[in-house]
Structure formats: structure tokens, C-alpha cells
């Protein structure tokens, strides 16, 4: 019977533990004519076997350690040993058992670190490894520190990544550890598999030497740098400094301003490179930022703060060439009549810019000087010896010295003597009736014109008038705008109307003067009028709650995860229908109902954050109006990409013979999102064989370089599998491999004589 | 020894059919598969088809499919090849051998005259 | 089909020399998968090299056989009288099975 260990040629998958004697036959082939015997080839390693009549199995302990995974092809054979049917892949899947412990790779470890380095930053990583599968807790290591010394107050100074062997200084570290104080450390660390979680697992330990170095790299104090300097530039003003040699030091100016005037030479040193001015920028905050010779910060940048001193550069300035005020010729003793107010450019609330006013001419000066006065410090007007009168002199003019401590400036001033203001706007109608609209009138139509008269002097104060709605339109939907010389008032649309919310409106008019009636006399009923305001039904479309909704979630979420929702309500009241429209990847879903987003494929950042689609909202009846509106999906990285080479590195050559062992730098790169520090790879030989004749040590976080052991290799192409770790939870490795060839050489290089032209290697070392 | 007998040699009349035998002997005729090949006066080799003995399933080359029969009587180990509606240009020596698993033709009869003449 | 083409069609040697067939395939096959045989006149072809290079039962090891791919060689390193007759090369990959058109082997 056909079943679980028998049945038709077919590809098929087969897991077996490693380590394990056979106990049974792996699975049973069935023949079909003319097939009459079967063939097992590929990665037996004399391990597996196929009987004639099809029964596959096995002949010892498999180890997965020598492979992981046993690519078989099976064959059917007729009576002449023709291949009847496939060859179909049998894959053979070898699992894990814990048989293997953590050996760390050096016995010893020596790193250094600087103090106040930022907490949590790797400054040294222990590497162990175990050959056991680390998809598998076999494999998964777990790091710890077992002991530090010394140990002071009970105080961990120093932590490591349980999953990395990153070490890394703790924030009570980061604020103690003083080189002064205690130059060294003495760490014994653990490695353990089963990712540390079982009474089973095995382990290893190695020693650490920590050696404490000062750390200079520190912002410098806020520097003051006056304005308008008449110095040679540039003005060295302050300085960084980082903590070894051959940093390369370089300025950012997060303002992105169009003009930065400010450098950094390559000792450290921070120059001012033209005059500043004050009144254009009063303080600049920039970073000061070094780096290693790949281009990779070498820490967090610096803060420089540089502030603008003020001098006294600016004159006061006039509001304008003739500043007009208006008295009414019954005016008391002390009324204001207006407040001249002069402009300094030079910093507030200092001496540059503090003012001081005073009249130094009045004309005419009838019926004599001296008819008004001005406050010294606040600019305002006051009549100072009696009333005036239109019909002797209906305007003066005065001239006001305006002065900082350096500067003086003169402006204008135009006093008109106007009539007393004691009539009252009278509206020509007090009623302007009912009137009808659409709810989508434009905004700026004029949709009524309102008439008051005034009979007070003309084209003064008194006669002005203004008109306000005082009740009806709370929202602000309508506005009136006066006519100066026919003092006609023109009613606008200011914001939409709404029947859904003010279908009708009784709205008051008042109308008044700019300048204030006399002692006794009020304004009246004839200064008020009304209308109605009717607003019609238009069906309008769906109104969104946003013009953008945002969302953010991690890019492995599940699929049938909410990942966001979008609210629209429709002014009539009707349900509405959402939909996506521009979802390109086929990564989402709306709920017609609800407005609800859900995931309905794997999403990915590296494909591109944020996802930006349009929601749509459709009236469910009526005119099925709709209306548009946005959806982002901010997608946070998680670590998804395993290491790579960051380029092509075919072409790698080494002259053969090698006089002296030699070297070469290669980089590494994924796609995943890297904080300000970049990457932090850690690199080794992809397998054990490897090392008798190659070393890899890591240059920086994306750097390794690759070192020959000895001299003596063959005429040929080498190919070095190098394992790559990018620390990241969960951690990713990548094997890379890198093609090496040793080749005769002809002035630097590759030699091959004519007709062998192929795969010339291009980069010789 | 290991041998492979064939019949004597035929005459015969355009359209009309031949049928030749093969004996094995010295080894197990179930064993290996039985070949047919022909060569034509002055010409090279051409394979014909096969039989099974064990299963009796045969595989005939596409130009002779629908003239051509292959049989065997386990009882006497012998295998057959009849060839029908002859033509002159069947006229050749008919040989049988025997064929070794994912391997060649290690042992040939004598080879049996036909001759196609009106 | 695997067509198989023999050069050359007549080699004339002395009894002494070096003789080299060539047997070319159309489709590359497994090199244990092409056989030679030898036939004299009136004689039934005989097993003579099998799977590229494996001389049969009774075959002087003057007789050698090379190649992979779609190009195969026979190989007499001094030619004797006996050796004179037809070499036919074949094709056990696939069906239908098929041999070179021979190449004649005759003395100068």
C-alpha cells in the first residue's frame, strides 16, 4: 500500500537526525514498466543507498556538521539502463543535535576603550563559534560576562550582547570610568549554546583585557564671535579634537543655510570665514563630525554653538514718511492722540535698540508751541496745553528726533484737527430681508450691499464707518467690507456655507466709527439692521478627517495585521465605502466598512518606506460622490538581509610567486537600516579549512581584510568563503566568497599567453 | 559458453513477411535484454528495437514501429523478430545480441541472410 | 535522435603505424555511454571497446579509446595485419540506439 514509506517516483524531502543509527528504510520507490530497477546518484557520501527494487535508505549515523543537507537524484531505470523516469530531487535534511560545544576563538582577548564612550557601543567583540545548526538552539549562543575586575562599589562598568559577544560599556561606565582612577580591566566571559537556557548546554571561557584611554572628543564651550568684525578672515574661533590621529574632520549645517560661514581644517580646528551680521542670523548651531579614512563616523558628532554679539550698526527707522493721527477739536487735556512707533534693528532689550523720541519742531505754531507733547521712552502723543480748534489751524505737523545711543533719526508726523464726532451711522434700511443660497456659493462672492450714512465732517473718523456682524454667524462664514468713499458696505463669502450645520441665519449688522463719540451721545437702533441668510441642500462628497493619515509598523508583521485606519464622514449623512486605490505592491486591504487597513502580503522596507497609497470614500447611495485622500505606511526596519559583499570583487589576483605574505580589503553591506554608527560586521573564515593558509581581522564595522598565512600557493584560482555576522537581532550571516588568483605576472599584471584570455583578473595585490 | 543461434536464411517475395529465431544458451535468458540490428549489403549497423524477456515489453526504433514484432518463448529461451510487407530494400543480414545492462551488445548471433526478390 | 559520424570513412595505413578514428556526437553523452565494436568481412560485429576506454575480453592493449563530451577517439598505437577490419562506434544514452556509418581500416 502506498503511504507514508512508500509510493511513485516524485521529489520528496526527508528529515533525519544526525548522530542517529538507522533503524528503518527511508522510503519505498515504486516501479512503473518499462522502469525495472532504480539509480541513486549526487551527495551520497556511501551513506545512502537504493536497492534495485527501489527501497532507499541508509547505512550509518548521518553527521550534520560534514552536511547539512544530502542533494539526491533517483532515477528509474528499464532493462537496457535508460533513464525512464526523472531523475527527481530526493533532498535529504540532516537535523541538529547538540554535539558540538562553543569554543571561543582566541583564548585571550585585548581590546581598549575611551572613557565617557557612548554606553552600548561596541568597542570589542569576543567571537565563539559552534558547529551545531544556529537555526537551532544547538547553536545559538549566549554570552556573559562572568566576572569584571576590579569590581567597584558592586558596579558593572562594562556589559556584553548576550547575542553578539559585543561588549560594550554600561551608562555607569560610560559616567566613571576615569583612566586616572583604574587604567585596566580583567573580564572573564562565557559562551554557552542552547542559547544559554539549558542545564545541558555546553560552554567555554576566555579573558579579556580592557586598557581605559582618555577621551578628548568634546563639544567645546559656546563661542561668542561679535558682528561686523574688521579682522583678516578666517578667525580661528574654537576646536575639536578626536582622540587618535588621521581623523578627517568635517562641519554640518543642519539649517541647510544658503550661506555657512564656518570651517574646520583637517588639525580640528574651527574657523569663522567672513563677517557675520546680527540683524541676518543671531546664533548658528552646527556639528562638527570625524571620521575614519572609509568615510564611517568615528562617534556622535559634536554640538558647536556660536552666538552673534550685537554692536550698535542700526539707526532707529520710521514706521513710515508721514505718520497721520486725527484729534477732535474738543479733545481734553492728556488724551492720546496716537503712538509713534520707531524701529531698531540692533538686538532688543539693549542699549543699541533702546529709543528715546522727542519733538524738536511743531508747525504752525499757532495758537502757540508746544501744544503737544511726546513720552520720551514709549513714542505716544498727548495734547499738552488745550483744545483745538478746527477753523483757526485744521492741521499741524511735527518733526520727532528718534535716538538709540549711537544714532538719530527724524520722522514725520501729520496732526488733522477734525470735527467733534457727534452723529451717530444711520442705516438706511433696518431690515434687508430674506436671502437664498447654495450651499457651494463661491467663497468671494458679494452677496448683499448695505447702506449707512453718517453726517459728521466727511472723510475723517467721525464719518468713517465700519460695519460688524454682531450676531448670527458665529463660524465667521461672511465678512463686510466698506467702500471708503461711499461708506457702502459689501457682504462676502469668507468660508463655505453649510446647510448642514446653519441652514438658516439671522444676522445683525452694526455700524460704527473708528473714532468715539462724543460725552453723551450713543449709538442707537438705527445703527443695527438684519437679514436672513437661507442656505440650500448641495450633495457634497465624502469629507476625509485628514489630508494624510500616517501609520507605522515594523516591516515583518504578520499577515492580516491592522496596520492603520482611515475616518471620512459624509456631510448628508450617508454610509460610506472605502477602497485603496495605487496599492502597487498588493501589500493591503481596507475594510469597506470600517476604514480599517490590514497587511495581506509580507511587507518590506528595503522595498521601499514609506508605502504610499489613496484611500478612497464613497457615498453608499445618492450620487456616489467620492473623495481622495492618503495613506502612508512608515515600515521600521527589523534585520531581514543577511550580510553581502558590498561590490564585485571578481578580479582579485596575488603575482605568483609571493615574495611576502600580502593582504586585501574588501567590504561588506546589507539592506537593512543602519542608525548613525553604521554597520557592525564581524568576519571570519567561512570554514575551518580555510585557515592553514588564510586570515581574515576586521578593519572597522564594514572593513575586513584578507591576509595570505604563507607563501606557498599553486598557479591558480583560490576560492575563500568568508562568514560575515551583522550583529543584528536576530543576527544574520552571510557566507561570501571571494575569488583569489595567484597568477604569473608581466609589469604588475596578470600574464596569459594569447588565447587564454578569459576572466583576467584586474586588481592585482 | 555464452552463445546466440540464429535460424538459416530466407527468400522472399516483396510484401510478404519473415519471421526469424534466435537461441540463447549459457547464460540466464530472463536476464538481459535481446536487440535486433540489421545491416544492408555494403552498409553499417542500425538497431532495430528490443525485448524484455523478463516482462515481455519490447521498444521498437520509430522507422520499423509498424512492420515489425518482437516475441520470446521463455520455455525454450529463444527470442523472434518477424518482419512484415517486405520490401527490396529490406534485403540484409538480421543479427541478434544480446544487450548488458547500462552497458553495450557483449555477445552477436551468426546474423541471418534475408533476401527481398521478386 | 543521437546521429554519430565517423571520420574518416577510409583510413590506409601500413602494418607498424598509428591509427586515431574518430567517432562525433551530436548532443554530448556520458562518456560511458559510447561503445566501439570491430567487423570483419562475413563476420557478426564484435564487443571491442567499451563505455570510452574499457578494452573487451581478448582485446590487445595496443587498442586504446578517449574522449568525453561529443568527441571520441580509437586509438591503434602500431597497427598489426589482424587489426585491419571496420570500427563501428554506438550510443547507449538514449533510444533509439545508433551507430556510426564505420570507418575501413585497410592496409596501404
Known amino acids: 500500500q502506498e503511504g507514508k514509506f512508500s509510493g511513485p517516483l516524485k521529489p520528496m524531502t526527508f528529515s533525519i537526525y544526525e548522530g542517529q543509527e538507522p533503524s528503518q528504510i527511508i522510503f519505498q520507490f515504486k516501479a512503473n514498466p518499462p522502469a525495472v530497477t532504480f539509480e541513486l546518484t549526487g551527495e551520497t557520501d556511501n551513506i545512502f543507498v537504493i536497492e534495485r527494487e527501489g527501497l532507499l535508505y541508509y547505512n550509518r549515523a548521518l553527521d550534520r556538521e560534514t552536511r547539512s543537507t544530502h542533494n539526491l537524484q533517483v532515477a528509474a531505470l528499464d532493462a537496457n539502463g535508460i533513464i525512464v523516469e526523472g531523475p527527481v530531487p530526493i533532498t535529504i535534511k540532516v537535523k541538529d543535535i547538540n554535539d558540538n560545544r562553543p569554543t571561543f576563538l582566541q583564548s585571550k582577548y585585548e581590546g581598549s576603550v575611551r572613557q565617557n564612550s557612548r554606553p552600548g557601543k561596541p568597542f570589542l567583540y569576543v567571537n565563539a563559534t559552534d558547529l551545531d545548526d544556529p537555526a537551532t538552539p544547538n547553536g545559538q549562543l549566549y554570552y556573559q560576562i562572568v566576572i569584571q575586575l576590579p569590581m567597584i562599589n558592586n558596579v558593572m562598568y562594562f556589559q556584553i550582547n548576550n547575542k553578539t559577544g559585543a561588549i560594550s560599556l554600561t551608562r555607569e561606565g560610560s559616567q566613571e570610568l576615569n583612566p586616572a582612577k583604574n587604567p585596566s580591566y580583567n573580564l572573564v566571559i562565557s559562551v554557552k549554546d542552547m542559547g544559554g537556557q539549558s542545564e545541558n548546554s555546553f560552554s567555554d571561557t576566555t579573558s579579556v583585557d580592557i586598557i581605559v584611554t582618555e577621551n578628548i572628543w568634546k563639544a567645546p564651550k559656546p563661542v561668542e564671535m561679535v558682528e561686523n568684525s574688521t579682522d583678516p578672515h578666517p578667525i580661528k574661533i574654537t576646536q575639536v579634537r578626536w582622540n587618535d590621529p588621521g581623523a578627517q574632520y568635517s562641519l554640518v549645517d543642519k539649517e541647510k543655510l544658503p550661506r555657512f560661514p564656518f570651517s574646520i581644517d583637517q588639525e580640528g580646528d574651527i574657523y569663522v570665514t567672513q563677517p557675520l551680521d546680527r540683524e541676518e542670523k543671531d546664533a548658528y548651531v552646527f556639528y562638527a563630525v570625524a571620521k575614519d579614512e572609509y568615510g564611517k563616523p568615528l562617534s556622535y558628532p559634536l554640538e558647536i554653538h556660536v552666538k552673534v554679539k550685537d554692536i550698535n550698526d542700526n539707526p532707529p527707522t520710521c514706521p513710515s514718511p508721514v505718520t497721520v493721527f486725527e484729534v477732535q477739536e474738543n479733545e481734553r487735556l492728556g488724551n492720546s492722540i496716537g503712538t509713534l512707533t520707531a524701529h531698531d534693528r540692533d538686538e532688543e532689550n539693549t542699549a543699541n535698540s533702546f529709543l528715546n523720541y522727542r519733538i524738536v519742531e511743531q508747525t504752525p505754531k499757532l495758537p502757540m508751541d508746544g501744544l503737544f507733547l511726546i513720552q520720551t521712552y514709549a513714542g505716544m502723543l498727548q495734547l499738552a496745553k488745550q483744545s483745538l480748534k478746527k477753523q483757526d489751524t485744521p492741521q499741524y505737523n511735527l518733526t520727532i528726533e528718534v535716538s538709540d545711543k549711537d544714532f538719530k533719526t527724524l520722522c514725520f508726523v501729520q496732526i488733522n484737527v477734525i470735527d467733534i464726532n457727534d452723529q451717530i451711522p444711520i442705516f438706511e434700511k433696518s431690515d434687508y430681508g430674506n436671502l437664498t443660497l447654495a450651499e457651494d456659493t463661491n467663497i468671494g462672492s458679494t452677496i448683499l450691499t448695505i447702506q449707512a450714512t453718517d453726517a459728521d465732517e466727511p472723510f475723517t473718523g467721525s464719518s468713517k464707518i465700519l460695519y460688524h456682524i454682531i450676531k448670527g454667524d458665529s463660524e465667521g462664514r461672511l465678512g463686510v467690507d466698506t467702500d471708503p468713499h461711499t461708506n457702502t458696505g459689501y457682504v462676502i463669502i469668507k468660508k463655505p456655507l453649510d446647510f448642514e450645520t446653519a441652514a438658516v441665519s439671522n444676522i445683525v449688522f452694526k455700524a460704527e466709527n473708528p473714532e468715539p463719540l462724543v460725552f453723551g451721545v450713543k449709538y442707537n437702533a438705527s445703527s443695527f439692521a438684519k437679514f436672513t441668510l437661507i442656505v440650500t441642500d448641495v450633495n457634497e462628497a465624502p469629507q476625509f478627517s485628514q489630508h494624510v493619515f500616517q501609520a507605522k509598523v515594523s516591516e515583518d508583521v504578520a499577515i492580516g495585521t491592522k496596520v492603520g485606519n482611515v475616518t471620512a464622514k459624509d456631510p448628508e449623512g450617508l454610509d460610506i465605502s472605502y477602497s485603496l486605490r495605487g496599492d502597487t505592491r498588493g501589500w493591503l486591504k481596507i475594510d469597506h466598512v470600517t476604514g480599517e487597513i490590514f497587511s495581506v502580503a509580507p511587507l518590506d522596507r528595503e522595498a521601499g518606506s514609506p508605502y504610499r497609497v489613496q484611500v478612497v470614500a464613497t457615498e453608499v447611495g445618492g450620487s456616489s460622490l467620492s473623495s481622495v485622500s492618503e495613506f502612508h505606511l512608515i515600515l521600521m526596519d527589523v534585520n531581514d538581509n543577511p550580510p553581502r559583499l558590498a561590490k564585485d570583487y571578481t578580479g582579485l589576483f596575488f603575482c605568483h610567486p609571493l615574495s611576502a605574505p600580502g593582504s586585501l580589503i574588501f567590504e561588506a553591506t546589507d539592506d537593512d537600516q543602519h542608525l548613525f554608527r553604521g554597520p557592525h560586521f564581524t568576519f571570519s573564515l567561512g570554514s575551518g579549512s580555510l585557515q592553514n593558509d588564510w586570515e581574515v581581522s576586521k578593519i572597522n564595522g564594514t572593513h575586513a581584510r584578507l591576509s595570505t598565512r604563507h607563501t606557498e600557493f599553486e598557479e591558480r584560482e583560490y576560492v575563500v568563503l568568508i562568514r560575515i555576522n551583522d550583529g543584528g537581532r536576530p543576527p544574520l550571516e552571510g557566507i561570501v566568497s571571494l575569488p583569489v588568483t595567484f597568477c604569473s605576472c608581466v609589469e604588475g599584471s596578470c600574464f596569459r599567453p594569447a588565447g587564454h584570455q578569459t576572466g583576467i583578473p584586474t586588481v592585482g595585490m | 559458453q555464452v552463445q546466440l543461434v540464429q535460424s538459416g536464411a530466407e527468400v522472399k517475395k516483396p510484401g510478404a513477411s519473415v519471421k526469424v529465431s534466435c537461441k540463447a544458451s549459457?547464460?540466464?535468458?530472463?536476464?538481459?535484454?535481446m536487440h535486433w540490428v540489421r545491416q544492408a549489403p555494403g552498409q553499417g549497423l542500425e538497431w532495430m528495437g528490443y525485448?524484455?524477456?523478463?516482462?515481455?515489453?519490447?521498444y521498437y526504433n520509430q522507422k520499423f514501429k509498424d512492420r515489425v514484432t518482437m516475441t520470446r518463448d521463455t520455455s525454450i529461451s529463444t527470442a523472434y523478430m518477424e518482419l512484415s510487407r517486405l520490401r527490396s530494400d529490406d534485403t540484409a543480414v538480421y543479427y541478434c545480441?544480446?544487450?548488458?545492462?547500462?552497458?553495450?551488445?557483449?555477445?552477436w548471433g551468426q546474423g541471418t541472410t534475408v533476401t527481398v526478390s521478386s | 535522435e543521437i546521429v554519430l559520424t565517423q571520420s574518416p570513412g577510409t583510413l590506409s595505413l601500413s602494418p607498424g603505424e598509428r591509427a586515431t578514428l574518430s567517432c562525433s556526437v551530436s548532443?554530448?553523452?556520458?562518456?560511458?555511454?559510447l561503445h566501439w565494436y570491430q567487423q570483419k568481412p562475413g563476420q557478426s560485429p564484435r564487443p571491442w571497446i567499451y563505455?570510452?576506454?574499457n578494452l573487451a575480453s581478448g582485446v590487445p592493449d595496443r587498442f586504446s579509446g578517449s574522449g568525453s563530451g561529443t568527441s571520441y577517439t580509437l586509438t591503434i598505437s602500431r597497427l598489426e595485419p589482424e587489426d585491419f577490419a571496420v570500427y563501428y562506434c554506438?550510443?547507449?544514452?538514449?533510444?533509439?540506439?545508433?551507430f556510426g556509418q564505420g570507418t575501413k581500416l585497410e592496409i596501404k
Open positions: 549459457g547464460y540466464t535468458f530472463t536476464s538481459y535484454t
Open positions: 525485448i524484455d524477456p523478463k516482462s515481455d515489453y519490447n
Open positions: 563505455g570510452t576506454s
Open positions: 554506438q550510443q547507449w544514452t538514449s533510444y533509439p540506439f545508433t
Open positions: 545480441a544480446r544487450g548488458f545492462f547500462k552497458g553495450y551488445f557483449d555477445v
Open positions: 548532443s554530448s553523452i556520458s562518456s560511458s555511454n
